[in-house]
Every structure is written in structure tokens, then in C-alpha cells.
Interface confidence: low
């Protein structure tokens, strides 16, 4: 796994720990909490970087309206279980025996139940509709604009290949992001949509995961884009299973 | 290379006890919850037992509860299965295998995919 030799860092992933014990005295990088090697030429997946995250110290629109099975995460942060890949496994517990399903970005799309809860095969989130709101300014972005500098930063920064931003839409002030990529279209290596996201989401927060870099300074035409409010959709292959209870609560 | 080697399997007669051990090698193991199956001829494999990460957790199969205990040790990176009272119904070849946990206190339920298996170490209980 490829690291920065000189100082034995992680540039994709800060929540590591890093030494010179890999073959021939390569760096090698483990991640917090799960005690994973992660590749560091990569984004290190978003179940890995969660439970590493757990386990540090407490401290006529041109708009896309999400499908009535789009998921947000209200959760908020779990300690999840991940399998050898980093992935998210399918069924999730807490220490109380509680359990649900995960699709791929690790969103709950069930009910939660007990141990005997099944949760069959891991469902993959496709489509991600990431929502922004940005702060006033003096005037409307050029959307043309706007739309070339949130290209190059998804493939620049968080190395995801192009054609899977299906569009970038913009209704002053609100930003839409659409990131698409079925399981046919993922090839070995490319970036997933939700690892990007993710990594996007704490960019955006100002908890940059990326080693030593200073934060995201994202600028259109020179004028700084300053994000006040993001909310993330996320569709899945195949629509959540929740009772008639929550859908009407 | 990740491995989970079983032994202490054998003949027994029906009444006795065995000790099964399970060594883990080749992974953090202290982030793993083990679990241990087994497979009686023309029977599908079943759980048996299985423990957290911390040892602190651990559940039974209602055939096997009151008989058998689970345990680990991390320092020796080995978890084991005192079976005592066993009867015939109890023969087949025994498995443990290791899933990945994100806690230290929940148990692996018994049909859960795990992710790594060992090759199996026989018990036979006979007269």
C-alpha cells in the first residue's frame, strides 16, 4: 500500500496509524479502530473511516426532486460492522441487540428488529443526490461555471471518474449534486459514489479527511463558494423495506 | 494469510467431555467475533455457539445450552468450546470462523455470513 515514505503517512486517510513495517520496509497504513490495512493512493471506504471515527476520542425546476424511496441518514453516527473489503455489512447491530439493514453507503433502509433480523444481500446505493445551499452573494454563479468546478473537484480531489457525475443543477442559491454509478458500471479501482460523498460531506463540514491538506476552499470564477446547509438523498437498486408505521408517522 | 485452525475433536462415548480450540492467525483478531458450527453427515451445517469481540457476550444454540461454554482468550489468540455431557446427536465435524465486528459486546447471530472459516475437526460420540 502506497504511503508517503519519507514521513509514513496515510495523504487519503488521517484516521491511521502508519509505520515502516510493510514488505521491504514499506510504509504501511492501518485504520483506526478496525486495525485495516487501507491503500492510500485511494479513498479509504466510508464504513472504515465511520468506525474509525467511533473509536476516536469524543471531542418547472431544473431541481431534482428525490424519489419517495430516496433514504437521508437520521441515524447519525454507529459503530458499524464492515467486512475484509471495508464494505458494509449488510446487517448492523448496536450493543443492545438492536438490529437493521445498511444498503452500500451504510444508510439504514429497514426497520430495526432484533438478532433474528435478515438482512440478505448488501443493496447497493446507485444514486446520490447531494443537496447544497450556499450563502448569499452578490450574484447568481454562472451555472456553466459552477458545473466545470464541481467536476474537477470530484475527479481532482476525490479521484471519482467523471462519467459518473450525471449532473450538477443549480437554482439560486441551491446546488444539486448527482452522482450515479450502478454495480455494472464500477470497475476495479474506480472511486465509489458513496465513499465520495462522504468524503465530500466532511469536506464541507470542515472535517477534511485527506492527511496535512488544508481545508476545501472551493471557488467559482475566484468567488468563494461557502456552503450553509447540505442535505444528502440516497437511492438504492432496489427500494427500502420500512412498515406503513414510519412511512406515516 | 488469514487462518483459523480447530483441534480437540476425537472419540468420545456419550456422557464425556471434549475441549475444541480454535487458533487464530494471520489478523487483528481482537476485532473478530467467533462462532463455532458444525455439520452432521447429510445434515446442514448449524451454529453451535458464538462469542464477542471482548468475550463478554455470547450465545447458544437451545440444543446445546447448559452443556456447552464458549470462551476466548486474546493473549493466546484462541477461543475454545467446553463440551461436556455429549451425546450422539452431538457428532459431526465442527467449524469455527471469525466475522468481522463493529463492537465489542454484540455476539455474531449464528446464520450470519462470516468472514473467514476454518477447516473442521471431527467429534464423534459413540458407545
Known amino acids: 500500500h502506497t504511503a508517503a515514505q519519507d514521513n509514513c503517512t496515510c495523504p487519503t486517510n488521517k484516521m491511521t496509524v502508519c509505520s515502516p513495517d510493510g514488505p521491504g520496509g514499506r510504509c504501511q497504513c492501518r485504520a483506526l479502530g478496525s486495525g485495516m490495512a487501507v491503500d492510500c493512493s485511494t479513498l479509504t471506504s466510508k464504513c472504515l473511516l465511520l468506525k474509525a471515527r467511533m473509536s476516536a476520542p469524543k471531542n418547472a425546476r431544473t431541481l431534482v426532486r428525490p424519489s419517495e424511496h430516496a433514504l437521508v441518514d437520521n441515524d447519525g453516527l454507529y459503530d458499524p460492522d464492515c467486512d475484509p473489503e471495508g464494505r458494509f455489512k449488510a446487517r448492523q447491530c448496536n450493543q443492545t441487540s438492536v438490529c437493521w439493514c445498511v444498503n452500500s453507503v451504510g444508510v439504514r433502509r429497514t426497520d430495526k428488529g432484533d438478532l433474528s433480523l435478515r438482512c440478505d444481500e448488501l443493496v447497493r446505493t446507485h444514486h446520490i443526490l447531494i443537496d447544497l445551499r450556499h450563502r448569499p452573494t452578490a450574484g447568481a454563479f454562472n451555472h456553466s461555471d459552477l458545473d466545470a468546478e464541481l467536476r474537477r473537484l470530484f475527479r481532482e480531489r476525490y479521484r471519482l471518474h467523471p462519467k459518473f457525475v450525471a449532473a450538477v443543477h443549480y437554482e439560486q442559491p441551491t446546488i444539486q449534486i448527482e452522482l450515479r454509478q450502478n454495480t455494472s458500471q464500477k470497475a476495479a479501482g474506480d472511486v465509489d459514489i458513496g465513499d465520495a460523498a462522504y468524503y465530500f460531506e466532511r469536506d464541507i463540514k470542515g472535517e477534511s479527511l485527506f492527511q496535512g491538506r488544508g481545508g476545501l476552499d472551493l471557488r467559482v470564477r475566484g468567488e468563494p463558494l461557502q456552503v450553509e446547509r447540505t442535505l444528502i438523498y440516497y437511492l438504492d437498486e432496489i427500494p427500502p423495506k420500512f412498515s406503513m408505521k414510519r412511512l406515516t408517522a | 494469510e488469514v487462518q483459523l485452525v480447530e483441534s480437540g475433536g476425537g472419540l468420545v462415548q456419550p456422557g464425556g467431555s471434549l475441549r475444541l480450540s480454535c487458533a487464530l492467525s494471520g489478523f487483528t483478531k481482537d476485532y473478530y467475533g467467533i462462532g463455532w458450527f458444525r455439520q452432521a453427515p447429510g445434515k446442514e451445517r448449524e451454529g453451535v455457539s458464538c462469542i464477542s469481540v471482548s468475550g463478554s457476550s455470547t450465545n447458544y444454540a437451545d440444543s446445546v445450552k447448559g452443556r456447552f461454554t464458549i470462551s476466548r482468550d486474546n493473549a493466546k489468540n484462541t477461543v475454545y468450546l467446553q463440551m461436556n455431557s455429549l451425546k450422539p446427536e452431538d457428532t459431526g465435524v465442527y467449524y469455527c470462523?471469525?466475522?468481522?465486528?463493529?463492537?465489542?459486546?454484540?455476539?455474531?447471530?449464528?446464520?450470519?455470513?462470516?468472514?473467514?472459516w476454518g477447516q473442521g475437526t471431527q467429534v464423534t460420540v459413540s458407545s
Open positions: 470462523a471469525a466475522a468481522f465486528m463493529g463492537s465489542d459486546y454484540v455476539v455474531p447471530e449464528m446464520s450470519r455470513e462470516y468472514d473467514y
